[in-house]
């Protein structure tokens, strides 16, 4: 986890000032897959490679991420640098760091639910867990499931708790997560939305 | 491109079932929901449920719950929709209807099916 | 259900003037509203979503506004292509629910 993002970062401070300002003027037209959207221009044009690539990596995660800046890289002529990053990218990845879930390497690609792609996120930041357990309860949780939650001393426990059942849900299931999620933290919805 | 493609007008008697069909193609048909909306003549629109071909799930709007079943065929990349006991409320266009793209936090409709008239008349 | 009211139900003006049509939510629906453009025998066609991102092609004249229950869709200066009927639809929760319409017709 984080390889992608470093040899992203690594390309694009091994750019000139020039080259750099032509790699955002091209990702501004740069062909996209289907459902992902664009950086805005205004917030783009004045980044730095290090805020570039965190922004890469918020908005097309860390493969499509690096894929998209190979693209970039190639097209600017710039084969042998595209060349070295998905080098990078594509070597064996190890294991994750204790304690941190390695993301699935489809992370952003269509097919993943917003609840999976933010998995992480909403362990973090979701506050009202009380609430999102009753919209869910007799629907989605059963009274064990319910329970087992409940029981967990600290919010992100309790989301980690609840994301330990998601795996067995299906999407109209995870769509009533979002929903709850929406009427109850429409702000962290939007905010995940937005990244 | 993504194209959504019905099937044609039906007339069909009361207390029937009528099944259309939508036939996507230009996106991978698991990736995505497909929605149904209708229009009865001269009104607005109503959603009445969606299916994530990815895993067959569907969600129904309670008002059509047990009259409206959605399915999809992912060797063909078609989803169906099939109402029963029919009525002439019934009668309007059925729409399919995919998002502009379904892994967001909302559904809202991009790509439209050209429409399927049903006509329920006795 | 959520119910979402438009207002006006017929909006008569010229191509050139401005047209403001109205979405009302029956609750709050944070941002969650998208707005529709139908012309007869036609499919809707996406204007609006999230209440005020621009869908890909729609033109500039367009614009979304507002949160909470109160929406606004604003064509700022209506070209003759742009007479049909509108309509809001709110994805904030199920099931996903439609406004009646509101007809913009040539004056």
């Known amino acids: 986890m984080g390889r992608a993002r470093d040899a992203i970062l690594d390309a694009l401070e091994n750019l000139t000032a020039e080259e750099l300002k032509k790699f955002k003027l091209k990702l501004l037209s740069v062909p996209l897959r289907e459902g992902y959207g664009r950086i805005p221009r205004g917030a783009l044009l004045s980044m730095d490679a290090l805020d570039l690539t965190d922004k890469l990596v918020s908005f097309y995660l860390e493969t499509y991420g690096a894929e998209l800046t190979a693209n970039v890289l190639r097209d600017m002529g710039l084969q042998e640098m595209a060349g070295q990053l998905q080098a990078a990218t594509h070597q064996g990845s190890g294991a994750a760091p204790a304690g941190i879930q390695a993301p699935p390497q489809s992370a952003a690609k269509p097919g993943l639910h917003f609840i999976d792609q933010h998995r992480a996120a909403l362990i973090a930041r979701v506050t009202n867990v009380e609430w999102l357990l009753d919209a869910l309860y007799g629907k989605v949780l059963t009274d064990e499931q319910y329970q087992a939650v409940r029981a967990e001393p600290t919010n992100p426990s309790k989301m980690r708790k609840l994301f330990s059942f998601t795996p067995a849900w299906n999407w109209t299931c995870k769509d009533l997560l979002l929903q709850a999620l929406r009427e109850s933290q429409s702000y962290l919805v939007e905010d995940l939305e937005r990244s | 491109q993504v194209q959504l493609v019905q099937s044609g007008a039906e007339v069909k008697k009361p207390g029937s079932s009528v099944k259309v069909s939508c036939k996507a193609s230009?996106?991978?048909?698991?990736?995505?929901?497909i929605h149904w909306v209708r229009q009865a003549p001269g009104q607005g629109l109503e959603w009445m449920g969606y299916i994530y071909p990815g895993d067959s799930s569907a969600m129904y709007n309670e008002k059509f719950q047990g009259r409206v079943t959605i399915t999809a065929d992912k060797s063909t990349s078609t989803a169906y929709m099939e109402l029963s006991s029919l009525r002439s409320e019934d009668t309007a266009v059925y729409y399919c209807a995919r998002p502009l793209y379904s892994y967001a936090s909302y559904y809202w409709f991009a790509y439209w099916g050209q429409g399927t008239l049903v006509t329920v008349s006795s | 259900e959520i119910v979402l009211t438009q207002s006006p139900a017929t909006l008569s003006l010229s191509p050139g003037e401005r047209a403001t049509l109205s979405c009302h939510a029956s609750q709050n629906i944070n941002v969650w509203l998208s707005w529709y453009q139908q012309k007869p025998g036609q499919a809707p066609r996406l204007l609006i979503y999230?209440?005020?991102n621009l869908h890909t092609g729609i033109p500039a004249r367009f614009s979304g506004s507002g949160s909470g229950t109160d929406f606004t869709l604003t064509i700022s200066s209506l070209e003759p292509e742009d007479f049909a009927v509108y309509y809001c639809?709110?994805?904030?929760?199920?099931?996903?629910?439609f406004g009646q319409g509101t007809k913009l017709e040539i004056k």
């Open positions: 230009g996106y991978t048909f698991t990736d995505q929901t």
């Open positions: 639809q709110q994805g904030q929760s199920y099931p996903l629910t």
């Open positions: 999230k209440s005020s």
